[in-house]
Amino acid sequence: TGADTEAVVCVGTACYTAHSGKLSAAEAQNHCNQNGGNLATVKSKEEAQHVQRVLAQLLRREAALTARMSKFWIGLQREKGKCLDPSLPLKGFSWVGGGEDTPYSNWHKELRNSCISKRCVSLLLDLSQPLLPSRLPKWSEGPCGSPGSPGSNIEGFVCKFSFKGMCRPLALGGPGQVTYTTPFQTTSSSLEAVPFASAANVACGEGDKDETQSHYFLCKEKAPDVFDWGSSGPLCVSPKYGCNFNNGGCHQDCFEGGDGSFLCGCRPGFRLLDDLVTCASRNPCSSSPCRGGATCVLGPHGKNYTCRCPQGYQLDSSQLDCVDVDECQDSPCAQECVNTPGGFRCECWVGYEPGGPGEGACQDVDECALGRSPCAQGCTNTDGSFHCSCEEGYVLAGEDGTQCQDVDECVGPGGPLCDSLCFNTQGSFHCGCLPGWVLAPNGVSCTMGPVSLGPPSGPPDEEDKGEKEGSTVPRAATASPTRGPEGTPKATPTTSRPSLSSDAPITSAPLKMLAPSGSPGVWREPSIHHATAASGPQEPAGGDSSVATQNNDGTDGQK
């Protein structure tokens, strides 16, 4: 089935036509497209009102629409496989003619997500209610209908046709009939604006006798952005009505001559245009020819004008409209440039901050500066970045590599560091010996000492621990633990076989090995070399002759 009844509203630079007829969205779009348009957009409240007006016009003519609710396709669709985006006003739908994701929307209800089929939007009209500008048609989303099966299709559709400009409707100075034929093949006798390239047929006179005089005009572009019919003087003037009929077709004043002819005139401060009907201000700026924030500036003697744009904008090709200047094209910034309406701003990359000589300059952020260092221990600033380091006995840890974690020298794949017992401390470790053995001067080996049933050579006193400054790791010295059933460390020293060759007394001293090289205060990460627990001398029967050492922080040998 084709599209039947038709209504038309032209405003600004667009015309909207409303059609009744059960077509699928694809058929409706094709119908609009054949005449050079698309299914209508509804990108703003104003546009919604224009569309509502054309629908109201259609419904006044269309008595056949008896349904309480009526739907009309518009050009908002979502392709198969494209899912709903609730964060956007158009919810992932897009206008068939292209264009940006516009902020205006008027959804009838919350949309359900469905990506498996193409979805189309129609305007939902409640015909039981009067169409009011405050009650704009709601958007209803649903299947797009199927060509050739009217039962699945909705009542009608709205097309939109865009033009470079419009002519004023022809003003008749006497009885007559104007018929406009638009480029989209619609005929109408009443348009508030007539699109460029439309034809006007004027039949002057009253009645259907052959007496009516016909005139033919075309809406042409007379000058850039100036559209008119090329007619001069009022049309269909009739002496019997004089200036009494539609003010003689004149824009302002109508003057009757003695011979029945009459002329149009203008009020002070206005001048008559070439059509001998329309008046324009003598001050060309009074008609607000400049758009988009442009200011109208009068030329010499007030005869012509130029449009001037605010800073950051420039005139477009029409010389009437302002468009944003993309200042970023001139690379005014040292690093990043962001174009903004009427200006721009410079931004710095991560690791840099605004500063330094010149506008838009960036300088390195010293992440290691006092009070802002992100590192737990050592911090080295680099250009645009930094890196952290750890003191001896610690390794970098944490997701971002800013924390330091104690290296447990008593465990690990590197072989035994102590011949007998190994005590891990914060940032270091030391060796100890079982009862009856004493630590040799090398701090690693154990030698047989006087028989003693006291505790093994244990951790040193607090001041002897050799812990580095700046560590964030808790200060605890424990024997290298073995894990208990719940994953809780048990404070059992790691045993190594004691060397029997040493005659050193039993002592307990911190092991200061792997001393850092380089400038003082900068610590090199030590090579990770964990001692494995070596098998020690025969333990007393029962296997729990190991002696727990008391931590200085009061915990039971737990890190």
């Epitope: 009885p175 009645g207 002496p239 019997k240 029945g260």
Partner: antibody, heavy 115, light 113 residues
Framework: EVQLQESGGGLVKPGGSLKLSCAAS????????MSWVRQTPEKRLEWVAS???????YYPDSVKGRFTISRDNARNILYLQMSSLRSEDSAMYYC?????????WGQGTTLTVSS | DIVMSQSPSSLAVSVGEKVTVSCKSS????????????LAWYQQKPGQSPKLLIY???TRESGVPDRFTGSGSGTDFTLTVSSVKAEDLAVYYC?????????FGGGTKLEIK
């Protein structure tokens, strides 16, 4: 065939009111201006009122403010509402089709204003 | 208002004779835009309503016998009946439709001897 049929005439007291009607057929009524013309007992013809196809109304000073011409394009009827009637309004009232020139006249309806 | 003066007010002629009726307007009825004279002539037979004979001063209405001729321009107009017939007994009126208010001549009563 163009036909114009007036009705509504009669005897009215001075100061009274009356509404005349003219039923039109045989042409596109809405496209024509229409007029009322009266003929006095002395056979003098006087134009009374006109309405253009666009709905504009025109009156001579003698009836302005007292008579109102109107049309119903849907029903093809022309009206003349007369009020504050005077004895000099007594006449035969004709409905006239007034295109580019007045061509067809109805048969007329008589108004008599007398106490 | 435009004043229309018609003469004679009456005349009696024999069948077959030529009749001339004159109509003068107080201002020109010629419209410069279309070069037309906005003048009509009507015939009103006894007991009937007026019937259009001539419009645009010289154009005969369809169905009107060609013995009726209109002429003139501007302010002076003439209706001529070339050869009067008995059925031409009537009152003849001129009317200007150039400008509201429309105005009529006083009429010319044609009688047959």
């Amino acid at each position: 065939e163009v036909q114009l049929q007036e009705s509504g005439g009669g005897l009215v007291k001075p100061g009274g009111s009356l509404k005349l009607s003219c039923a039109a057929s045989g042409f596109t009524f809405s496209r024509y201006a229409m007029s009322w013309v009266r003929q006095t007992p002395e056979k003098r013809l006087e134009w009374v009122a006109s309405i253009s196809s666009g709905g504009g109304t025109y009156y001579p000073d003698s009836v302005k403010g007292r008579f109102t011409i109107s049309r119903d394009n849907a029903r093809n009827i022309l009206y003349l509402q007369m009020s504050s009637l005077r004895s000099e309004d007594s006449a035969m009232y004709y409905c006239v089709r007034d295109g580019n020139y007045p061509d067809y006249w109805g048969q007329g309806t008589t108004l008599t204003v007398s106490s | 208002d435009i004043v229309m003066s018609q003469s004679p007010s009456s005349l009696a002629v024999s069948v077959g004779e030529k009749v001339t009726v004159s109509c003068k307007s107080s201002q020109s009825l010629l419209y410069s835009s279309n070069q037309k004279n906005y003048l009509a002539w009507y015939q009103q037979k006894p007991g009937q309503s007026p019937k259009l004979l001539i419009y645009w001063a010289s154009t005969r209405e369809s169905g009107v016998p060609d013995r009726f001729t209109g002429s003139g321009s501007g302010t002076d107009f003439t209706l001529t009946v070339s050869s009067v017939k008995a059925e031409d007994l009537a009152v003849y009126y001129c009317q200007q439709y150039y400008r509201y208010p429309y105005t009529f001549g006083g009429g010319t009563k044609l009688e047959i001897k």
